[in-house]
Interface confidence: low
């Protein structure tokens, strides 16, 4: 018997293995990031690997446990929140997910001064939202759609609202459509900077039509889930904003903030609230036809105990080529004078840039400019403004962090991240401590993600917070696919694409091609980020080429590309995927008889329309939880891009852009349609209607439903889904199992 070493040394290739589907489903190659929970200019909290809550002081280098894992375990806490006066911690347990951001939980208050849980006047359960005041240890919480206030954790609560009612009136929390499509938060209440006032939204859903679907569960009869959900053109929620003095809440009670007259004249939305000082607040409003936004700065009138929003402090933002803003209207970042602010909006050339507004928007001073876009303003201090953009080397799918010195004239700009780890890191975000004394940089790729801590004055790296060493070691013997990001120039349109190539890719050979598409307005798929996911496996193990293409309607490349799809969803997004496929075929290494497309949500819509385009390019494709008609989707999202489904507006295109209208064209492709029956977002109705149209047209197709699963198809459904899709693609591409 000859014993052979487990590794053959004559070829490094032989020691390497391809990714497996199991690797992906088990999350074997997932990465970690480190976001400090800042509690001062130089201190942050972090939950250690063994679940202790640890306070770190950057300047002294000291760290100590403020809350032990035993205390966390005693109430099965999965989250925590330290009061600003550091006397109390809330512990969150019994997490129960509702929609994308919302969940309910049980909350316990732990007194750090005596090491005991606060007894007496305990919080009710389950609570929909809870938060500390920014100073001290006041608590605001939402229970059964009403808002309550506690001056101290052990005090009895003061009830602020009384009209809260399930599915009818929401106080301090958003209804479904505001949560998903406008605020992107689970809360709709905001403390003033020193905790004097509490602002909150009231959403009245009384007249909104309800979506109802079955939840099968385990009982003899299914439950019916009812959600007030305004579809395109339907009655919308009615929103009001109130502010209450939390020091003397019973004195005058909640005061309503007036809506600007030009907004209130027709249907409108509230889009965000930003406190400037304890006695100045900034509200943003948006017309239902979402091309006019008004930013309104309001002041507290001590004599009247009311909020005054003078017209001279109303700033109008209007788009003439599309909708206002990008995905959302941007929010202002106020400077230290408490009246001027920085905001991102389109410049005269149609690129989103930072502007400084001192008195009127007409006199705004443009801070950044160029054929690239400013993406986020992180922090404004007395002398610096930190923002992210995709300027560097003209790659729209990158993000670098910049500092503009606003304290000196002329302002100077410095890229903080461009040259730090240039090959590894091209896509950053940042998290700043108070006054930007320190900040953390989180790099998402294209190399293995890394999080680092930096000095806010010098930008010097202080330490590595997380470098994913274990992941790096685990990947050493994995044959990862190659990735390239390039662009196609077609008819004056730039189509950026990411191509994921098999490890032993050979340009002289022919490979099956899978297009992965999302393509929704203001989205971006071609990004310089690290990922080991399903498509990595398909390239590594199954030898497919995968491509992602950012076509018209996608973000961060200027308004011409972004607003091209305005009022015409489902046209150019599809055209551009098809155009890219034709270009890929011209490259010579694609087997044009084996081309597939797949997408989820908006991507499911685009993949369905691409398959039904009649081009003959695609052999097969998959749509997961697709939109099939814009009349079935949420008003706030749909109308932003499509207008209203009325005869005098855009009904014709609503009707022309459905998947069902193209049922006949699915005859010559293999189509796999997948949807969760409890999808609160893109309702199962969408796929039910596609299936009905295909059956009526006598077109064969494959389908899979996931009982009681929502838009995310999580848990065991995920494993089943990817296994099922893998079999479908391998069969389509004639790959052996």
């Amino acid at each position: 018997i000859v014993l052979r070493p487990s590794r053959v040394h004559n070829s490094e290739e032989n020691t390497m293995r391809a990714l497996t589907l199991k690797d992906i489903l088990n999350g074997t190659f997932s990465y970690k990031t480190f976001f400090p929970n800042w509690i001062s200019g130089q201190e942050y909290l972090h939950q250690s690997a063994d679940n202790n809550i640890v306070l770190y002081n950057i300047e002294t280098g000291q760290s100590y446990t403020i809350l032990s894992n035993r205390t966390m375990k005693s109430v099965n806490a999965s989250n925590y929140g330290l009061s600003p006066d550091r006397q109390f911690v809330y512990l969150e347990s019994d997490y129960s997910k509702l929609w994308r951001y919302s969940y309910t939980a049980t909350y316990y208050i732990y007194d750090l001064s005596n090491g005991e849980f606060v007894r007496g006047n305990e919080l009710p359960r389950p609570i929909q939202y809870l938060c500390w005041s920014p100073v001290g240890s006041k608590l605001a919480y939402v229970y059964q759609n009403n808002i309550y206030l506690k001056q101290r954790p052990g005090d009895p609560p003061f009830q602020i609202t009384f009209n809260g009612r399930e599915n009818k009136i929401f106080n301090g929390i958003p209804d479904w459509v505001y949560e998903e499509e406008m605020l992107a938060t689970k809360y709709a209440l905001w403390w003033s900077p020193n905790g004097k006032f509490l602002a909150y939204a009231e959403f009245n859903d009384t007249d909104i039509p309800v979506i109802a679907y079955s939840y099968y569960g385990d009982e003899q009869y299914p439950r019916t889930i009812n959600i007030p959900y305004p579809k395109a053109g339907a009655k919308n929620p009615v929103v009001r904003i109130f502010i209450i003095d939390t020091t003397y809440p019973a004195y005058v009670g909640p005061q309503e903030v007036p809506v600007p007259a030009m907004i209130a004249s027709s249907d409108y939305y509230f889009s965000w609230l930003t406190w400037v000082t304890d006695e100045r607040v900034c509200l943003q409003w948006l017309k239902r036809v979402q091309n006019v936004s008004v930013l309104s700065i309001c002041d507290f009138r001590e004599d009247w105990q009311t909020w005054d929003c003078p017209k001279t402090q109303e700033h109008i933002e209007e788009s003439r080529t599309g909708w206002a803003g990008g995905f959302f209207v941007s929010t202002p970042v106020f400077s230290y004078d408490a009246i001027s602010y920085y905001k991102i909006f389109s410049d005269k050339d149609g690129y989103k840039h930072i502007h400084y507004i001192k008195d009127t928007v007409e006199n705004a001073i443009q801070i950044t400019s160029g054929k690239w876009e400013a993406i986020n303003i992180f922090r404004v201090t007395q002398d610096s403004l930190f923002y992210s953009s995709n300027e560097f080397e003209e790659y729209p799918g990158r993000r670098n962090i910049y500092r503009i010195s606003i304290g000196s004239y002329p302002p100077s700009k410095k890229c903080v991240t461009c040259h730090l780890r240039k090959e590894r890191c091209q896509y950053y975000t940042a998290s700043f401590s108070d006054y930007a004394k320190y900040y953390a940089l989180v790099c998402y790729g294209p190399g293995i993600p890394i999080s680092t801590l930096h000095d806010g004055r010098t930008d010097q790296e202080i330490k590595i917070l997380e470098e994913n060493k274990e992941l790096e070691n685990a990947l050493k013997n994995i044959q990862l696919p190659k990735e390239e990001i390039k662009k196609l120039e077609v008819d004056e349109i730039t189509l950026w694409y990411k191509m994921i190539l098999p490890p032993q890719f050979d340009r002289s050979k022919k490979y099956p091609l899978l297009i992965q598409v999302y393509g929704g307005p203001c989205s971006q798929s071609v990004r310089s980020v690290f990922a080991v996911n399903w498509i990595s496996y398909l390239a590594s193990k199954e030898g497919m080429v995968i491509a992602l293409v950012d076509g018209r309607g996608t973000a961060f490349q200027g308004d011409k590309l972004l607003y091209a799809v305005y009022r015409k969803l489902g046209v150019y997004e599809v055209e551009d995927q098809i155009t890219a496929v034709r270009k890929f075929i011209e490259m010579g290494f694609i087997d044009e008889k084996r081309i597939a497309i797949w997408g989820w949500s908006y991507g499911g819509y685009v993949s369905s329309l691409a398959l039904a385009s009649g081009t003959g390019l695609f052999k097969c494709g998959i749509a997961v939880a697709p939109v099939s008609s814009w009349e079935y989707y949420a008003s706030v999202y749909t109308e932003r891009f499509m207008g209203l489904p009325t005869k005098d507006d855009n009904l014709e295109h609503y009707k022309n852009s459905t998947v069902m209208a193209r049922a006949e064209y699915f005859r010559n492709v293999d189509y796999l349609l997948i949807h969760g029956t409890a999808d609160d977002n893109v309702h199962f109705q969408n796929s039910a209607q596609i299936a009905k149209a295909l059956v009526n047209a006598q077109v064969d197709f494959q389908a899979m439903w996931y009982s009681d699963q929502n838009h995310g198809l999580s848990g065991l459904s995920t494993n089943h889904l990817y296994t099922h899709m893998t079999h479908f693609l391998k069969q389509c591409f004639s790959l052996s199992d």
Epitope: V289, I316, E317, E318, R320, T321, S346, V361, E362, A364
Partner: nanobody, 118 residues
Framework: EVQLVESGGGLVQPGGSLRLSCAAS????????MGWFRQAPGKGRELVAA????????YYPDSVEGRFTISRDNAKRMVYLQMNSLRAEDTAVYYC???????????WGQGTQVTVSS
């Protein structure tokens, strides 16, 4: 480029009316929000009316609300300011202006004088 020429100014008694017109040339007119500004002697330029590109949205400061009306005719490339119940404090040079999509006014006319006096 957008060129703007105002007309219709003149002398009027308090309580009277005037209609200012602004003729625009240049191919991007219909994409521009438009505004009327005024500048009284020794004072800064003040926005008195604004209108969105479609005419669907208008804006007036409190000082002229209910008295002034802005309108536009995209086909004729004209913007109008109807001024009623004029007061002495409305005396100023009135300028027509064209903005970008966020109502930054970057094109200006030469101005027309309005004098309200008995």
């Amino acid at each position: 480029e957008v060129q703007l020429v105002e007309s219709g100014g003149g002398l009027v008694q308090p309580g009277g009316s005037l209609r200012l017109s602004c003729a625009a040339s240049g191919r991007t007119f219909s994409y521009n929000p438009m505004g009327w500004f005024r500048q009284a002697p020794g004072k800064g330029r003040e926005l008195v009316a604004a209108i969105s590109r479609t005419g669907g949205s208008t804006y007036y400061p409190d000082s002229v609300e209910g008295r002034f009306t802005i309108s536009r005719d995209n086909a004729k490339r004209m913007v109008y300011l109807q001024m009623n119940s004029l007061r002495a404090e409305d005396t100023a040079v009135y300028y027509c202006a064209a903005g970008t999509d966020t109502w930054h006014y970057n094109y200006w006319g030469q101005g027309t004088q309005v004098t309200v006096s008995s």
